[in-house]
Interface confidence: medium
Amino acid sequence: DGCKDIFMKNEILSASQPFAFNCTFPPITSGEVSVTWYKNSSKIPVSKIIQSRIHQDETWILFLPMEWGDSGVYQCVIKGRDSCHRIHVNLTVFEKHWCDTSIGGLPNLSDEYKQILHLGKDDSLTCHLHFPKSCVLGPIKWYKDCNEIKGERFTVLETRLLVSNVSAEDRGNYACQAILTHSGKQYEVLNGITVSITERAGYGGSVPKIIYPKNHSIEVQLGTTLIVDCNVTDTKDNTNLRCWRVNNTLVDDYYDESKRIREGVETHVSFREHNLYTVNITFLEVKMEDYGLPFMCHAGVSTAYIILQLPAPDFRAY
């Protein structure tokens, strides 16, 4: 059917609560595109009727709520005037029981559900809530080990929980809860977060922290030159390598012949407690085939990507 297949990583979701996924992979096209969602290679698109439990909302697929039986591979098809991309997203439902430690058996959670606080520092946890504009999120409540968090050391600021003077007792199972309203109906969103404390002053033992990029898209005109920095904080004695990859290949190897896209020379700034590393990627001339590809910055076990996107596409979902 002429569509290029792109396979995204698995998304692990909680049963019996709202979930949304945005088809943000920009197409290799200029101007108008259409976005259509399908489930398990069905020829019938996901409904666009907002009363449907599962429906397409602009470029998003929205589950109100996600439920057992919804696991599967969903396809988002982006059609432009001269191109077609089919993005495959594997959604897996799991049992979220942040309050019941006796049950156990959680899968390997993404970084959104595993967060680190730094001992003796002022730090914060983030509640990751990704929903379309049609979903209105109420104020966020935070819980630790099933009890609502109160006290002078804790401040709720938008989607973050600020923790001052982090202590060892702050490790444990947290949850952030918000009420989501959609078409007059209310749903509870509850995200469990496993919090560990690092005793290392700075940045989490030997796990580097990628400050930038943050898994996002960058709007860039065709033909322009683009330089993107990857900024990483890591411990002073770390042995981690930092590099840019595309399609699991070092960019310098992937573009060995054309040398159109190159990794820069790494630099670092030394602070008292940690090092800040910068390694850039340079696009001498942005070409059509660069759009929609995740360019990954790797730092030890940490990864983050950018995706190049044409400016202001008109996402008309039809």
Epitope: T92, F94, E95, K96
Partner: antibody, heavy 118, light 112 residues
Amino acid sequence: QVQLKESGPVLVAPSQSLSITCTVSGFSLTKFGVHWIRQTPGKGLEWLGVIWAGGPTNYNSALMSRLTISKDISQSQVFLRIDSLQTDDTAMYYCAKQIYYSTLVDYWGQGTSVTVSS
Amino acid sequence: DVLLTQTPLSLPVSLGDQASISCRSSQNIVHSNGNTYLQWYLQKPGQSPKLLIYKVSNRFSGVPDRFSGSGSGTDFTLKISRVEAEDLGVYYCFQGSHVPFTFGAGTKLELK
């Protein structure tokens, strides 16, 4: 505490429809799914289907064309309907609660005995 | 559909004996999320089934520690270390990994 109680007709004629109500207490139907299971002397325990907290259902493929499971959250009730009854639908019918955020089952109702006979 | 085969169908024991019941599935019952949704019930005459073990090896609240579950993939076992009179009845395994969910045929634990 958690309780489930099935209620329905004791005797139903072949080719008719069977409707059983499961009234629950001690938990919310917006947070937990409810399974339907039946037990016959010949077939043992047979899973019929489930209605999940969010509303969708899964059914036993062998009975799917005849089964409907629905619920009324405000009344804390779950309903099982089986059409075109046959004599081998004679069984003890149970509703059972989903174990916390899992596909499995923890608490069962006491069951209601249904005989299909003319 | 996943077929669960329980053996033996009847298990005569003396009080204080160890008892072992096998449940074999016709296909792997690991759910796509990594969990194995296999559980064990005990049903006594005139009663509804009671949950003993969930997710292969987790004892449900209030279940004595003489009950233990083990296994993976397609082979699962329920063990009772020392059978007591209240343990007599029919034991069923159940899988909740693949729709339609299914039960084993049952194993009757009875006195010799």
